[in-house]
Each structure stands twice: as structure tokens, then as C-alpha cells.
Interface confidence: medium
């Protein structure tokens, strides 16, 4: 009798759907070749395939096997019109599994999934399941068509780890799950507001998100023109306001507030606010005569366009006299004054329409 081949080896590639059959050659000399058959077991619906190869070959491939179906693979030694008993084995080609599942567009209540749809006519779709990490029962399940490569899971809770699986579906079978874990975002605060704006302080308030277990809030602030110079404050989760101090006058700041849950930060709530102008300081008087004197002051730290100086007799209810000088000057001589009279002098720094608080002094002629 003809000796059958030996050491039958079956390998199905789930990505390509190709079954590779290999064997060790028959010991019978001068054989014609080998006949290889693949048949679904137990009368299952599916293609029966057959290949005949030359005697010098020890492998062959089959395409178009249905994933998830069990096949019986047999290899016979053929010599003229005779055949050996076969060497046989069974294999179930795996349903192809997603290899490139990734997360996109993560919010505090949704997670977007993206994958490349598999190129196989036997795939009828994908099943998406969501489990809160550490729990057993899926809280969510849905099915999508085989052409779909994007899905958004919604209605999730903030700051929670979710195990999300995508399973390839075929008629009567499914792949092993491709599972990734992702945490939904921490809920951000809302409604950022600025009040009590001073030259070097501002009060920042926000509406906390409805998370009763936040670790803290992180407040970061820096001058818009120097965003590398960031200061950071950690605020108790029970507070929703902070006063920023030691700021630069007349400077626009970018302020962000984030919620922190364990080691996870929310997306920042951002806003901009400019500090007020600081006043000129150090008012002083010189060159005092019967009808004039010179007023001196020290410039504020803020960038300014000029000054407005008003003066009037101390017990005078009429309109004060007003002078304007450019930012480059820090003195002015007031003339045509009344002898022996106490004058009130006020100086305001200006930056466009913006005004600093008053610097006030008194001097007699």
C-alpha cells in the first residue's frame, strides 16, 4: 500500500484568511503527487475545496475558508489511480480580530473609538461592549455594520475607567475581543469669573463641577506676553474662589482652572483678565512761589500713555483745572495760582481710556 504523508501541519492566518497545509513527504517512491481536501465537519454549511500538487511539493494553501467553521483537512499520497489512506486533522480558522483599536475624542461622558474595518466578506459587523473596570456585567452593548470604523460610546460617567471591547462578528461566530481600558475625562469647572480687579490682585471664581470626590482644583496663571512664567495654586475642592496677588499692574493674565480627581486633571477652564493700572506714587512739591509750584511724582510700574493732573483750591466747589502730560514726564509746573492758598492736586496715570487710582497731595502757594 502507498504510505501516507506524515507530520501534517495546519496554519490559518486570521488576517488574510489563508490556510497553509504542510506535511512531510511519503516514503513511497515514484509517486504522482498529493491530493489535499478541506471539508466542513459534521455537514456544516461551507465550501469543500480540493488541491492536487506535484510529488516534489510538501505544502499548499487554501483561500476563502469561512472563519469560525471547523474544517477537516486530509492529505493523500497519489500514485497513478491509487491513493493512500489520508493523514487528517481539523482546524477552525479564527475570526479575524481588530489590531488597531484606538481612542479618540474623550470627554467626561463619552469615548470615541476608531479602527480599520477588516477586509473580509465573511464579516457581518462588530459588537462593542463597555464594562466599568472591575465590574463583570456590561453596562452597554451595541452592534455596527462591517464597513464602520468609528463609534462613540456615550452616557458614561466622568473619571471612571472603562474596559471597552470590539468583537468581529461573522454568521455563527465571533472573534476574540480586542479590549482597551480608558478613563473618561474629569469634569471641568464652568463659569469662570473675575471680580475685585486691582493693580496687583484679582479674585477668580468658578462653578465647581458636580463631583463630590474631587481631590482639588488647580489654578494656573501667567502674563499673556510671558506664558512660560506660570504660577500654580492648589485649591481645596470645597472652595470655588481664589484671590491672585503680587500681579503686575496693567498686565493681561491668562488664568486656567482645572478639576483634579486622583492623578487625573480635567481640561482647563480658561479666561483672560487685565489687572488695573497702579497709581503714580511719591507726590512731592518744589519751586513754590506766590502763584506757582512744581509737582513731582514717581511713575507707576504699568505701561501708560500719559498722566492727567487736576488742581483746585481746597475749599473750592467749582470745576478743577486739568493738565495732561506724556508718559515720559514726571513733573509739571502749575501757574496762575492764587497766593496764600492751599491747593489739592490729583494725578492719574492713563493708558488709553484706562485710568489708575488717584494720587493726591496738598500744597500752599
Amino acid at each position: 500500500p502507498l504510505s501516507p504523508p506524515t507530520n501534517l501541519h495546519l496554519e490559518a492566518n486570521p488576517d488574510t484568511g489563508v490556510l497553509t497545509v504542510s506535511w512531510e513527504r511519503s516514503t513511497t517512491p515514484d509517486i504522482t503527487g498529493y491530493r489535499i481536501t478541506t471539508t466542513p465537519t459534521n455537514g456544516q454549511q461551507g465550501n469543500s475545496l480540493e488541491e492536487v500538487v506535484h510529488a516534489d511539493q510538501s505544502s499548499c494553501t487554501f483561500d476563502n475558508l469561512s472563519p469560525g467553521l471547523e474544517y477537516n483537512v486530509s492529505v493523500y499520497t497519489v500514485k497513478d489511480d491509487k491513493e493512500s489512506v489520508p493523514i487528517s486533522d481539523t482546524i477552525i480558522p479564527e475570526v479575524p480580530q481588530l489590531t488597531d483599536l484606538s481612542f479618540v475624542d474623550i470627554t467626561d461622558s463619552s469615548i470615541g473609538l476608531r479602527w480599520t474595518p477588516l477586509n473580509s466578506s465573511t464579516i457581518i459587523g462588530y459588537r462593542i461592549t463597555v464594562v466599568a473596570a472591575g465590574e463583570g456585567i456590561p453596562i452597554f452593548e451595541d452592534f455596527v455594520d462591517s464597513s464602520v470604523g468609528y463609534y462613540t460610546v456615550t452616557g458614561l460617567e466622568p473619571g471612571i475607567d472603562y474596559d471597552i471591547s470590539v468583537i468581529t462578528l461573522i454568521n455563527g461566530g465571533e472573534s476574540a475581543p480586542t479590549t482597551l481600558t480608558q478613563q473618561t475625562a474629569v469634569p471641568p469647572p464652568t463659569d469662570l469669573r473675575f471680580t475685585n480687579i486691582g493693580p496687583d490682585t484679582m479674585r477668580v471664581t468658578w462653578a465647581p463641577p458636580p463631583s463630590i470626590d474631587l481631590t482639588n482644583f488647580l489654578v494656573r496663571y501667567s502674563p499673556v506676553k510671558n506664558e512660560e512664567d506660570v504660577a500654580e495654586l492648589s485649591i481645596s475642592p470645597s472652595d470655588n474662589a481664589v484671590v491672585l496677588t503680587n500681579l503686575l499692574p496693567g498686565t493681561e493674565y491668562v488664568v486656567s482652572v482645572s478639576s483634579v480627581y486622583e492623578q487625573h486633571e480635567s481640561t482647563p477652564l480658561r479666561g483672560r483678565q487685565k489687572t488695573g493700572l497702579d497709581s503714580p506714587t511719591g507726590i512731592d512739591f518744589s519751586d513754590i512761589t506766590a502763584n506757582s509750584f512744581t509737582v513731582h511724582w514717581i511713575a507707576p510700574r504699568a505701561t501708560i500713555t500719559g498722566y492727567r493732573i487736576r488742581h483746585h483750591p481746597e475749599h473750592f466747589s467749582g470745576r478743577p483745572r486739568e493738565d495732561r502730560v506724556p508718559h515720559s514726564r514726571n513733573s509739571i509746573t502749575l501757574t496762575n495760582l492764587t497766593p496764600g492758598t492751599e491747593y489739592v492736586v490729583s494725578i492719574v496715570a492713563l493708558n488709553g481710556r484706562e485710568e489708575s487710582p488717584l494720587l493726591i497731595g496738598q500744597q500752599s502757594t
Epitope: 470627554t107 467626561d108 461622558s109 466599568a132 472591575g134 465590574e135 453596562i139 460617567e157 466622568p158 473619571g159 471612571i160 469634569p187 471641568p188 464652568t190 465647581p208 463641577p209 458636580p210 463631583s211 463630590i212 470626590d213 474631587l214 470645597s238 480627581y261 486622583e262
Partner: antibody, heavy 123, light 113 residues
Framework: EVQLVESGGGLVQPKGSLKISCAAS????????MNWVRQAPRKGLEWVAR??????????YYADSVKDRFTISRDDSQSMLYLQMNNLKTEDTAMYYC??????????????WGAGTTVTVSE | DIVMSQSPSSLAVSVGEKVTMSCKSS????????????LAWYQQRPGQSPKLLIY???TGESGVPDRFTGSGSGTDFTLTISSVKAEDLAVYYC?????????FGAGTKLELK
């Protein structure tokens, strides 16, 4: 079926102490935050205390009315929840309910309640 | 603290009647980011412990008859019983879980006429 059974209530004098307990069954106790909620006679409900799970470092939270007097604790190996009440006041007289947190989230409501245990603070 | 106000404090009804009760919060319980309202409703029958009916203001707890519905958003919420049954005679409490401390309303008592 999830069950919470409270015990340990009784009559205690003002400034006295009492420890009440809650035995949990039918749930993976160690994964849930647990609470005590009380109800004074013919009054409404008042949340008292909460303890989170081991994975959240057993963090505790209290109502202002019981802070520094009451201590919530748990023994996951026995599926037990406790409330140690010290320096009791007459206004602490109430039915005390052991309550499980609902939902898998930072936000929660109370989805399983025990039958309660009565604490009476009186001379 | 968020203050929860319920009205009316009691309500006399006949079996089969439709009933609505109100719950108002001192600040909004709606979180703009996920459009959820952090409000729950409970039922407490005489001599029993409270039972969860509704959470997220309108989601019915499993096993709760569908004659109970929750509605509303922001600061104004309503619990409706479409056709009252004898076993619905109880006190109904609303509760906010937006922030600490968790607070309940004083309750609405449903009684038979």
C-alpha cells in the same frame, strides 16, 4: 439579592457613646462606597457619613452636624460597615440607615437601604 | 449647602388619580458638560426604609413601575404618578447629589382622600 442589616442601636445618655454596625451580603462589598443616613422621629432624611473603597484610600466624609463626633469605618473582609458615635446629643436620636452607593461614578445616589437601627439619646 | 424644597408637604388623592409633586433646588443641578441633572427621588412607605425610584432626574430604577416618572431640569423638578395605587401612599423625598453635603427635601406625604 443585596441585603444590608443594621444592628447595635439602643438607648444611650447624652455625652455617651455607641457603635452601630451594618452587615452586607449579596454584593462585592469592597468595591462600593457606603453611607449612613439618619431619620429623626417624624422628620426627613439626613445624610450623615460616607466611606469610599480601599482603592480610594477609604476616604471619609461627614455632615457638619456630626463632624469630630462620629467616625465611619469598614471591614471589607467581613463585609461590615460601622459608625462610632461619641459625645452623643439628644438631636442625634434617629433611625440610622446603612446605605449603598448607586452607580459606578463620582456622582451617586442611594440605591440599596437597610431596614435601619434605632438610636435614642435621652437621660 | 444646596437647599431642597418640596411642595406640597401633603397631598390627599383618590386611587386612580394622576398626581404631581414638586421639588426645587437653591442652585442648578444641571451640569452643562454632560446635560445631566443630579437629582434622585425616593419613596418611603409607612414603617419601611426609603426606596430609590428615579435618578438623573428622569431615569427609573429597575423594577420601579412605569407609572412613576421624573421630569424637570436645572432647579425645578417634578415627580408624577400617572394613576395612583393604594401601595403608592407614602412619603416622597427628592435628593441632590450635585455637591456635598448631600441634601434631601422635607418630603411630600401622599394620603388617601
Amino acid at each position: 439579592e443585596v441585603q444590608l442589616v443594621e444592628s447595635g442601636g439602643g438607648l444611650v445618655q447624652p455625652k455617651g457613646s455607641l457603635k452601630i454596625s451594618c452587615a452586607a451580603s449579596g454584593l462585592t462589598f469592597n468595591t462600593y462606597a457606603m453611607n449612613w443616613v439618619r431619620q429623626a422621629p417624624r422628620k426627613g432624611l439626613e445624610w450623615v457619613a460616607r466611606i469610599r473603597s480601599k482603592s480610594n484610600n477609604y476616604a471619609t466624609y461627614y455632615a457638619d452636624s456630626v463632624k469630630d463626633r462620629f467616625t465611619i469605618s469598614r471591614d471589607d473582609s467581613q463585609s461590615m460597615l460601622y459608625l462610632q458615635m461619641n459625645n452623643l446629643k439628644t438631636e442625634d436620636t434617629a433611625m440610622y440607615y446603612c446605605v449603598k452607593q448607586g452607580g459606578n461614578s463620582l456622582y451617586w445616589y442611594f440605591d440599596v437601604w437597610g431596614a435601619g437601627t434605632t438610636v435614642t439619646v435621652s437621660e | 449647602d444646596i437647599v431642597m424644597s418640596q411642595s406640597p408637604s401633603s397631598l390627599a388623592v383618590s386611587v386612580g388619580e394622576k398626581v404631581t409633586m414638586s421639588c426645587k433646588s437653591s442652585q442648578s443641578l444641571l451640569y452643562s458638560s454632560n446635560q445631566k441633572n443630579y437629582l434622585a427621588w425616593y419613596q418611603q412607605r409607612p414603617g419601611q426604609s426609603p426606596k430609590l425610584l428615579i435618578y438623573w432626574a428622569s431615569t427609573g430604577e429597575s423594577g420601579v413601575p412605569d407609572r412613576f416618572t421624573g421630569s424637570g431640569s436645572g432647579t425645578d423638578f417634578t415627580l408624577t404618578i400617572s394613576s395612583v395605587k393604594a401601595e403608592d401612599l407614602a412619603v416622597y423625598y427628592c435628593q441632590q447629589y450635585y455637591s456635598y453635603p448631600l441634601t434631601f427635601g422635607a418630603g411630600t406625604k401622599l394620603e388617601l382622600k
